[in-house]
Interface confidence: medium
């Protein structure tokens, strides 16, 4: 028979014959022959291969370097890489999460729209009319101005995006 020019899925062509690829989690030790199947061996500790492959070396699991603020979010297996995330208060600088930076704080006049996660930074928004923030914070939302009316008080000083209103007693009518 004619030697094949293409092979089925999960096979590869070598020496004019189709050999089985190694399954995820295993590396190639030797190609198949007329007599024998492809030889594959499991990846070692801290190694992985995530596809059907003919790799002779497994990939090393990613190292989550604590010196860069990283920690393990999901431990790698023989078929998956380790997933790193950042320590509390920090977030990844890229999708690959190779290093971390401190979460941004929202300045006075701005509140937290979305609290930062291990992979995304704090999202701030300006405090709209009727709300304020007088602190720099990575957690605090804009607070509503105090309602003087509900306390039977009157506004003595108007609020801003950075300060609350100041309430005071109503002026008494003199007889």
């Amino acid at each position: 028979p004619e030697p094949p020019t293409a092979c089925r899925e999960k096979q590869y062509l070598i020496n004019s014959q189709c050999c089985s690829l190694c399954q995820p989690g295993q590396k190639l030790v030797s190609d198949c022959t007329e007599f024998t199947e492809t030889e594959c061996l499991p990846c070692g500790e801290s190694e992985f291969l995530d596809t059907w492959n003919r790799e002779t070396h497994c990939h090393q699991h990613k190292y989550c370097d604590p010196n860069l603020g990283l920690r393990v979010q999901q431990k790698g297996t023989s078929e998956t890489d380790t997933i790193c995330t950042c320590e509390e208060g920090w977030h990844c600088t890229s999708e690959a999460c190779e290093s971390c930076v401190l979460h941004r704080s929202c300045s006075p006049g701005f509140g937290v729209k979305q609290i930062a996660t291990g992979v995304s930074d704090t999202i701030c928004e300006p405090c709209p009319v009727g709300f304020f923030s007088n602190v720099s914070s990575a957690f605090e939302k804009c607070h509503p101005w105090t309602s003087c009316e509900t306390k039977d008080l009157v506004v003595q000083q108007a609020g801003t995006n950075k300060t609350d209103v100041v309430c005071g007693p109503q002026d008494r009518l003199r007889a």
Partner: nanobody, 118 residues
């Protein structure tokens, strides 16, 4: 220079056992498939058994399946063939071979004679 040196052959009664050895040198043994072939008097070469570099994958001729076991010790650069339940038709010169192929014969030892007779 590649060298393959077989040993362990001899005269054995039908139903008996023998273990052949092949000491290899001159190449990185653990990188190659190895095999045993035999030639009976007045007949052509027949592949008996083949083993992959790590011993994970093996091949046996139908005539020896269940009776012969191929193995290797890469730390000792040695190939083995354990032959059980021997029959008269197993009488042959047994050759150790590197990189076995049905279509070519790379490197061979000088052979060891196995005679099965009562």
């Amino acid at each position: 220079e590649v060298q393959l040196l077989e040993s362990g052959g001899g005269l054995v009664q039908p139903g008996g056992s023998l273990r052949l050895s092949c000491a290899a040198s001159g190449f990185t043994f653990s990188h190659y498939h190895m095999g045993w072939a035999r030639q009976a008097p007045g007949k052509g070469l027949e592949w008996v058994s083949v083993i992959g570099p790590r011993g994970i994958s093996t091949y046996y001729a139908d005539s020896v399946k269940g009776r012969f076991t191929i193995s290797r010790d890469n730390s000792k650069n040695t190939l083995y063939l354990q032959m059980n339940s021997l029959r008269a038709e197993d009488t042959a010169v047994y050759y150790c071979a590197k990189s076995p192929s049905r279509h070519r014969f790379d490197y061979w030892g000088q052979g060891t004679l196995v005679t099965v007779s009562s």
